[in-house]
């Protein structure tokens, strides 16, 4: 039950995380104009991964796409790539994890297969989350560097009374969405990996069990018991029948009541 809950919760958390990564990637507010020097600006600038926008006090907003690929900074391209890789991996992970969910029956899929799929999706979610966090962090670092560079050159042409104020950019909402979403995807992935451990069946459930009757001895192997009942509680090599069943190692030292008639 705990395994199912962990797996289900991991799936939901990852789903929310990946939706957040997609939202962050599409958002225009990766960087927003710093209003420290002019809190009542009549023209507000903000930029995303795909386009830059200007919102005027009049209410009009104009957005322009970056219609060049070669002219863009390498860092921006890297951030785009990281976010897209994160989305792709996350989407594949979601697809895999749907089939891996314990609560969903697909044909006669064994627990071992579901465990493998859960682990695969978990790893994909972890990498997806890391890609998103890395992408957002690279962009944030780029902003911080540019912010202090433009602060140093805040006013150019101060020889006369004319001032040219450089626009500085600070963290936009998309960065925070990206960090949170990446974190959620990462957590979801870890939960899936934890769930995988609970799903994985033991390699050898039980050793052969010997039954010694008076006339002849017959060996039984009730290794299929756990699988046939459909319950996953007996994962250790426990003795199932206390009446007369013993492992082969125990037979010599402990006589059974069936040895003497």
């Amino acid at each position: 039950m705990a395994v199912t809950a962990c797996q289900g919760l991991g799936f939901v958390v990852s789903l929310i995380g990946i939706a957040g990564i997609i939202a962050a990637t599409c958002m225009d507010q990766w960087s927003t104009q710093d209003l420290y020097n002019n809190p009542v600006t009549a023209v507000f600038n903000y930029q995303g991964l795909w386009r830059s926008c200007v919102r005027e006090s009049s209410g009009f907003t104009e957005c322009r796409g970056y219609f060049t690929l070669l002219g863009l900074p390498a860092m921006l391209q890297a951030v785009r790539a990281l976010m897209i890789v994160g989305i792709v991996l996350g989407a594949i992970g979601l697809l895999v994890s749907i089939f891996a969910l314990k609560c969903i029956r697909i044909g006669s899929m064994e627990d071992s297969a579901k465990a493998n799929m859960t682990l695969t999706s978990g790893i994909m979610f972890i990498v997806s989350g890391l890609c998103a966090i890395a992408g957002v962090s690279v962009f944030a670092n780029m902003l911080v560097t540019n912010f202090w560079m433009s602060t140093a050159n805040m006013y150019t042409g101060m020889g006369g009374m004319v001032q040219t104020v450089q626009t500085r950019y600070t963290f936009g909402a998309a960065l925070f969405v990206g960090w949170v979403a990446g974190g959620l995807t990462l957590i979801g992935g870890v939960m899936m990996c934890i769930a995988c451990r609970g799903l994985a069946p033991e390699e050898t459930n039980y050793k052969a069990v010997s039954y010694h009757a008076s006339g002849h001895s017959v060996a039984y192997k009730p290794g299929g018991f756990k699988a046939s009942t459909g319950f996953g509680s007996n994962t250790k090599n426990k003795k199932i029948y206390d009446g007369g069943a013993r492992t082969e190692d125990e037979v010599q030292s402990y006589p059974s009541k069936h040895d003497y008639v």
Partner: antibody, heavy 118, light 113 residues
Framework: EVQLLESGGGLVQPGGSLRLSCAAS????????MSWVRQAPGKGLEWVAT????????YYPDSVKGRFTISRDNAKNTLYLQMNSLRAEDTAVYYC???????????WGQGTLVTVSS | DIVMTQSPDSLAVSLGERATINCKSS????????????LTWYQQKPGQPPKLLIY???TRESGVPDRFSGSGSGTDFTLTISSLQAEDVAVYYC?????????FGGGTKLEIK
Amino acid sequence: EVQLLESGGGLVQPGGSLRLSCAASEFTFSNYAMSWVRQAPGKGLEWVATISSGRSSTYYPDSVKGRFTISRDNAKNTLYLQMNSLRAEDTAVYYCAGLGRGNAMEYWGQGTLVTVSS
Amino acid sequence: DIVMTQSPDSLAVSLGERATINCKSSQSLLNSGNQKNYLTWYQQKPGQPPKLLIYWASTRESGVPDRFSGSGSGTDFTLTISSLQAEDVAVYYCQNAYSYPFTFGGGTKLEIK
């Protein structure tokens, strides 16, 4: 044709109050940020206040801050300017204007005269 | 606050001649986000409210005759009337539309010589 019609002007004593109204027609009033601009007799234009389309933001110059309040009722397509603690230097023709692209004052009313005198 | 300085204060030009009005701002009106200059020109005829002529320093408002043109960038701007008509007699104002408080130039009175 877009129409902006100001009303509420008149003679008022220094320290008194007045409320100007601007009724808009023939355009989507709720989509536009609106401003008040005044012009003292024989003088140039002076911006007085601006309100965003969603009523969330208001802006004033230091000369009227704390004394004037701009507001709007989108349901009634009406813009208001509440003027308190009026001074002689507030005497002017008050125009309401609708802001368009480039924050330009695209639509103008005919103006209403406010005279502050004892 | 951004100070807008217009020159000349008054200008007399013959009909059919070119009229040029200058406007200088104390700070750049160029927005780096869209590379547009937030300078607006208005025309005010006697007894009438102002009328929008040009926004973004060079974009003509619809319905404005093409003899009116705006140019300039950063801090220096110009309004040009290529061929003066009798109906162009008015006072012309430039305005900072880039940051609050919005400020107007002192105005240039255009007359016929």
